[in-house]
Amino acid sequence: DAEFRHDSGYEVHHQKLVFFAEDVGSNKGAIIGLMVGGVVIA
């Protein structure tokens, strides 16, 4: 099974979860996926 890394910052908008990557240099703040249940799809 695939593994998923869950970063700690997120906001919920209209039942979607937008992840914000942390500690990744110039990519800080980038949207990296939508969430369904406990799984993010990048």
């Epitope: 099974d1 695939a2 979607k16 996926g33 369904v36 799984v39 799809i41 990048a42």
Partner: antibody, heavy 117, light 111 residues
Framework: EVQLQQSGPELLKPGASVKISCKAS????????MHWMKQSHGKSLEWIGG????????IYNEKFKDKATLTVDKSSRTAYMELRSLTSEDSAVYFC??????????WGQGTLVTVSA | VVMTQTPLSLPVSLGDQASISCRSS???????????LHWYLQKPGQSPKLLIY???TRFSGVPDRFSGSGSGSDFTLKISRVEAEDLGIYFC?????????FGSGTKLAIK
Amino acid sequence: EVQLQQSGPELLKPGASVKISCKASGFTFTDYTMHWMKQSHGKSLEWIGGINPNSGGTIYNEKFKDKATLTVDKSSRTAYMELRSLTSEDSAVYFCTRGVYDGYFYWGQGTLVTVSA
Amino acid sequence: VVMTQTPLSLPVSLGDQASISCRSSQSLVYSNGNTFLHWYLQKPGQSPKLLIYKVSTRFSGVPDRFSGSGSGSDFTLKISRVEAEDLGIYFCSQTTHAPFTFGSGTKLAIK
């Protein structure tokens, strides 16, 4: 109102491939993940995989990773699933679904795929 | 994650209470405290329809005779007074862990 309109039934020969479509309406297509399920002869349900319409990023059930390919066309708000190297084991109803953050699904009406020599 | 539903078949009389159990092979509690366990009803020739999500939240339009409970890996769906429109196959589903999985279904039928 959320609507997921799937393509019609398919009768195919073993070894063939098929591409099923699912046209979405009533919501912002890029805000939600799209998923596909398999239901064999009225039995239980299996999750095939899901796709993020923004990026085209996918996640598959390991069982189906060599069987199914998920894609989307954002311009037409349509999700697709291609099934390849079909066998009788692939005969089933396939459902397109829309996921939400809370983890549940809205379902299309289903597409019957029959594989027979 | 294996979802084990019992019973496979549940014969009832209209007006009876019905109870369906769903157990998961591991905890369905996600790191943020949510438990992504859901219940669907599928009637013959139709797609599944959501009844309950996240263990106990009734979906919009679902009658209050349906209730969900449980925690961790042990969950129950109760129908307080079965009506004819409730007949069909009930599935539990988990979306905490990939791959997402479903129970084998419980057929609610008239006794």
